[in-house]
């Protein structure tokens, strides 16, 4: 007789990352009987929702249901029907919605109301939509990468099961770059966290962690670009903005109303004698870098040391995983290799930004022009943020690991968020019972 496979005793969870530029749906899976073990949850699917971030739907909320349909239907297909009702669905909105809420709490609630109504029509266990704080975003990103790297496991190994592993229990710091904010999170070495807002205390798997985190709102790559444009147009003599952060020959018309739409440009807002201006690229890395540095106020620091804008930052410690847009941008520029020094990265960026726009378009014919045009700025911004913003040096650069996935799961805040909300990270080390570990080799 044929052996019948026993039904898998597994559980699923869904997290939607409602970012400023787009929404992604992640499906996670884990063995039901090992919920409290570290490293057992893994990503089985990522579905990128077609269209912009949810904050862009403020004037067309009736389209939100259709917008979410494809990825929610994909979840319906991937997860067995028998599991639908038990599968929790969480939506976390990040800095794009934080900015909308700053403009109008009612408009933010309007968007989230329709998102919640739309998601509740699916057969899953919908657990609500909320705007997560920058602190949560940083903390959950840190939990995700360390969970996936096996840093919370008390069993020390003589071999490495994942890349980047340094075979010790030192946690990795987390560097997250989005479209509207960026987060830095790590365990400082014997350093007091001087500002309470930046201090987190965790007890995970029987160990205490004192974690530093900060989220810089408006310093995601897209909002940083809007800031830079708003700053530079102030001193332009006419409606032409010669911009070193775009390739030579590149031209784009920008509406002043779009420029001042975001709260991130309020500090640079002024009455201009024109309604539109034209960006003309001149492709100069050094000048672009200098322009970006003007976004970081380093003249004021009420602590022993700061990142920028008067925000406390302890001395950097250990290895860091840089993910989300840090990874996507550097991957596009082919600069994610561990062997590429900071000096080499700078050299490559100089060459890349100086390439004529027509040449770039030909070389990367398959890439949407909107994204393609911004890689020079984004790459330069990443260097500026890491070096001048967070005080990485040419030497400590080698401690930055640009990470897309770990063990098949995307690096980002979503996994940590789900682990927390489903109570799958115990404060204490779970007792090993022969039964629950009977399948271990």
């Amino acid at each position: 007789t044929q052996n019948k496979a026993l039904p898998e005793n597994v559980k699923y969870g869904i997290v939607l990352d409602a970012g400023s530029s787009h929404t992604s749906l992640y499906i996670y899976k884990w063995p039901a009987e090992k919920e409290n073990d570290t490293g057992v949850v893994h990503q089985v699917e990522e579905c990128r929702v077609k269209g912009p971030g949810i904050s862009k739907f403020v004037q067309k909320v009736n389209e939100i249901g259709i917008y979410l349909t494809d990825c929610m239907e994909r979840a319906r297909e991937v997860i067995p029907r028998s599991q639908h009702q038990e599968t929790p669905v969480y939506l976390g909105a990040t800095a794009g919605m934080r900015l909308l809420r700053m403009e109008s709490e009612e408009l933010a609630d309007r968007v989230l109301d329709v998102v919640e109504r739309s998601l509740s029509n699916y057969p899953f266990d919908f657990q609500g939509a909320r705007i997560i704080t920058g602190q949560e975003e940083g903390a959950y990103g840190w939990i995700t990468i360390n969970y996936l790297l096996g840093k919370f496991s008390q069993k020390t190994r003589w071999f490495s099961i994942v890349p980047y592993e340094t075979n010790n229990q030192e946690t990795f710091g987390a560097l997250d770059l989005g479209g509207a904010s960026t987060q830095v999170t790590f365990v400082p070495q014997n350093q007091t966290i001087e500002s309470p807002d930046n201090a987190l205390q965790f007890r995970l798997y029987g160990k205490d962690y004192n974690v530093y985190t900060h989220s810089f709102l408006c310093y995601g790559k897209d909002q940083a670009l809007w800031q830079k444009l708003a700053k530079d147009i102030q001193v332009a003599s006419n409606e032409i903005l010669r911009d070193p952060c775009f390739h030579p020959g590149y031209k784009k018309v920008v509406n002043v109303s779009d420029l001042y739409k975001t709260p991130c440009t309020k500090r640079f807002e002024m009455t201009l004698p024109f309604q539109q201006f034209e960006i003309q690229g001149i492709g100069n890395y050094q000048q672009c870098h200098q322009s970006i540095l003007e976004l970081f106020n380093t003249s004021y620091c009420p602590y022993s040391q700061c990142a920028f804008n008067g925000i406390f930052l302890p001395p950097l410690q250990g290895d860091f995983g840089a993910f989300s847009a840090f990874y996507f941008v550097m991957k596009f520029l082919n600069l994610t290799s561990e062997k590429v020094s900071q000096e080499k990265v700078t050299e490559m960026m100089k060459k890349f930004c100086a390439q004529p726009w027509e040449e770039i378009k030909t070389s990367y014919a398959g890439v949407k022009e909107k994204y393609l045009s911004e890689y020079c700025f984004s790459g330069t911004y990443i260097l500026s943020l890491l070096l001048q913003g967070y005080h990485f040096t040419a030497d400590s650069w080698e401690h930055i690991h640009f990470i897309g996935k770990i063990q098949g799961s995307d690096a980002g805040w979503t996994l940590g968020y789900m682990l927390n909300l489903t109570n799958m990270i115990p404060a204490e080390q779970p007792l090993s019972t022969p039964l629950s570990h009977s399948t271990y080799v």
Epitope: V61, N62, I64, G65, E106, D109, R110, L112, D113, V114, E116, R117, S118, S120, F126, Q127, G128
Partner: antibody, heavy 121, light 107 residues
Framework: QVQLVQSGAEVKKPGSSVKVSCKAS????????ISWVRQAPGQGLEWMGS????????NYAQKFQGRVTITADESTSTAYMELSSLRSEDTAVYYC??????????????WGQGTMVTVSS | EIVMTQSPATLSVSPGERATLSCRAS??????LAWYQQKPGQAPRLLIY???TRASGIPARFSGSGSGTEFTLTISSLQSEDFAVYYC?????????FGGGTKVEIK
Amino acid sequence: QVQLVQSGAEVKKPGSSVKVSCKASGGTFSKYGISWVRQAPGQGLEWMGSIIPEFGIANYAQKFQGRVTITADESTSTAYMELSSLRSEDTAVYYCARESGGYRDHRLGVWGQGTMVTVSS
Amino acid sequence: EIVMTQSPATLSVSPGERATLSCRASQSVGSNLAWYQQKPGQAPRLLIYGASTRASGIPARFSGSGSGTEFTLTISSLQSEDFAVYYCQQYLLWPLTFGGGTKVEIK
């Protein structure tokens, strides 16, 4: 002061459909959600679904998915609840209620008088 | 869905006495909880929202407390018009769910 006035009692045959209306007067109709709640004889309250008239977006309890349709007509400030494939267990008083807290605040501040729907062969 | 459980099912109280009704949620609903009063042949009426805020026109003898999963409705001194069925409802998550009700009857 907002008032909700519902259509009259109905007697229906099993397998048929019923459509109950709920007309709002004396306040903003579009922005606030309208929920439908039913109560079987001698039983508690059971939420069926809701709509924001402003956007025409409805959501339903899983139990009623595919059998209930909630719509709204902004021009007449009227919400409708249609329940199909009726069975005897659907005999109940059906209430419409306004979610009076605004977006994401679904407390039911104003109720209609109720519509008795009897399903009997 | 969030399951709401009310206790007791029936409460016998003399007029002028205090009545305490309980409501428990199967998971935290924060303060997104409402209490309703329903008299025979009538539609429910909102008494309390946000766990502790009285709706307009509701007498001060009605008070709500609690947050998270445990909630209480207190009627400080029962009047004859207060004998009715009381329902709690969570409105944090869809579907909106009600407790089974507590009938407050004359002792």
